[in-house]
């Protein structure tokens, strides 16, 4: 059954997968989706990487983690409760039914109605779309329009925090890291 | 294999509009990555001028940003630039290049120069 | 916008010599960093990205190095067909190049 996660409306939510590389950059391709890991592939793809970088994204969906390093964990920013529902992380080992597959499921919860206000909260409404330890270059009209010029390497104590949160702990203690090579 | 080749003008009036575009073979843009303009002015540097994404997000070098459209044609697999009000500056060679969401460039086409002169 | 200041802007070198190339931002950048090979009339070359990944099929004698703001490329033992101008470009922000280094044959 599904590992649960949990957030709220107009939260950022993370979901973590992780692997270890075989050797440091001999990256695996990884694919996200919403909807449970198919035989193969992931469905409704959200974000997807190749053996160098992130080359299929959607507006919302980012890995603020160290994905060179096996961090392939998503960040969902500021969500509604339309996003709530199984997420497929599908690392996709080379070789015929090698792929490890594992199926997250995320409850939205309503958010609070006086809910205090928090540092994430504040970043991610003055910085929609930044939340990153990674450079993911700049701003996209669809989303944002225009965007000053930020350093997202300032911001990355709070990804860190982020990342570091207890459910990240969760899955590595169920023991959902694979280990590549 | 990824192919990209520019095509366009060579030469331009100034303040009239520079229009190129990029044919892609050998990857739909719909499928993924960045794609991008580039440009290289004689003799100088380059200079990213922006990207339209495969979801068909775009996002522009602020410098630019008032004169520069980016857009796809998907049915051609093809994506284009269009400069207005161009000057003498604005001669360069330009290049479109496939980027990853952390924009650098793994591919490129071969170049297109284009001459802003009256 | 992010500065990218490389030098040297031009060095002149011999087959075999090792070669290295500095580049510094204006503010820290990371390791989103990339280098580029470049040969008159020709469009530029992937070399190296993230700082220090070797983009496929670019010969090992090619490293890079660095975060924040200071990054390297080197050269360990340059070939003929290595004499080119190479840029180191930032991807924190929006993408921007160094001023490029030109290798000669001395």
């Known amino acids: 059954s599904e590992v649960e996660y949990r957030a709220e409306v107009g939260q950022n939510a993370y979901l973590p997968c992780f692997y270890t590389p075989a050797a440091p950059g001999n990256l695996v391709p990884v694919c996200w989706g919403k909807g449970a890991c198919p035989v193969f592939e992931c469905g409704n793809v959200v974000l997807r990487t190749d053996e160098r970088d992130v080359n299929y994204w959607t507006s919302r969906y980012w890995l603020n983690g160290d994905f060179r390093k096996g961090d392939v964990s998503l960040t969902i920013e500021n969500v509604t409760l339309a996003d709530s529902g199984i997420y497929c992380c599908r690392i996709q080992i080379p070789g015929i039914m090698n792929d490890e597959k594992f199926n997250l499921k995320l409850v939205i919860k309503p958010a609070k109605v006086t809910p205090a206000p928090t540092r994430q909260r504040d970043f991610t409404a003055a910085f929609p779309r930044m939340l990153t330890t990674r450079g993911h270059g700049p701003a996209e009209t669809q989303t944002l329009g225009s965007l000053p010029d930020i350093n997202l390497t300032q911001i990355s104590t709070l990804a860190n925090e982020l990342r570091d949160s207890r459910l990240a702990n969760d899955l590595r203690d169920s023991g959902a890291t694979i280990r590549i090579g | 294999q990824v192919q990209l080749q520019e095509s366009g003008p060579g030469l331009v009036k100034p303040s009239q509009t520079l229009s190129l575009t990029c044919t892609v073979s050998?990857?739909?843009?719909?499928?993924?990555?960045?794609w991008n303009w580039i440009r290289q002015p004689p003799g100088k540097g380059l200079e990213w001028m922006g990207y339209?994404?495969?979801?068909?997000?775009?996002s522009y070098n602020p410098s630019l940003k008032s004169r520069i459209t980016i857009s796809v044609d998907t049915s051609k697999n093809q994506f284009s630039l269009k400069l207005s009000s161009v000057t003498a500056a604005d001669t360069a060679v330009y290049y479109c290049?496939?980027?990853?969401?952390?924009?650098?460039?793994?591919?490129w086409g071969q170049g297109t120069t284009v001459t802003v002169s009256s | 916008d992010i500065q990218m200041t490389q030098s040297p802007s031009s060095l002149s070198a011999s087959v075999g010599d090792r070669v290295t190339i500095t580049c510094k931002a204006s503010?820290?950048?990371?390791?989103?960093v990339a280098w580029y090979q470049q040969k008159p009339g020709k469009a530029p070359k992937s070399l190296i990205y993230?700082?220090?990944y070797r983009y496929s099929g670019v010969p090992s004698r090619f490293s890079g190095s660095g975060s924040g703001t200071d990054f390297t490329l080197t050269i360990s033992s340059l070939q003929p067909e290595d004499f080119a101008t190479y840029y180191c470009?930032?991807?924190?922000?929006?993408?921007?190049f160094g001023g490029g280094t030109k290798v000669e044959i001395k």
């Open positions: 339209i994404s495969h979801s068909g997000s775009t």
């Open positions: 050998g990857y739909s843009i719909t499928s993924g990555f960045a």
């Open positions: 470009q930032q991807y924190n922000s929006y993408p921007t």
């Open positions: 993230s700082a220090s």
């Open positions: 503010q820290n950048v990371g390791a989103n």
């Open positions: 290049a496939r980027g990853y969401r952390s924009p650098w460039f793994a591919y």
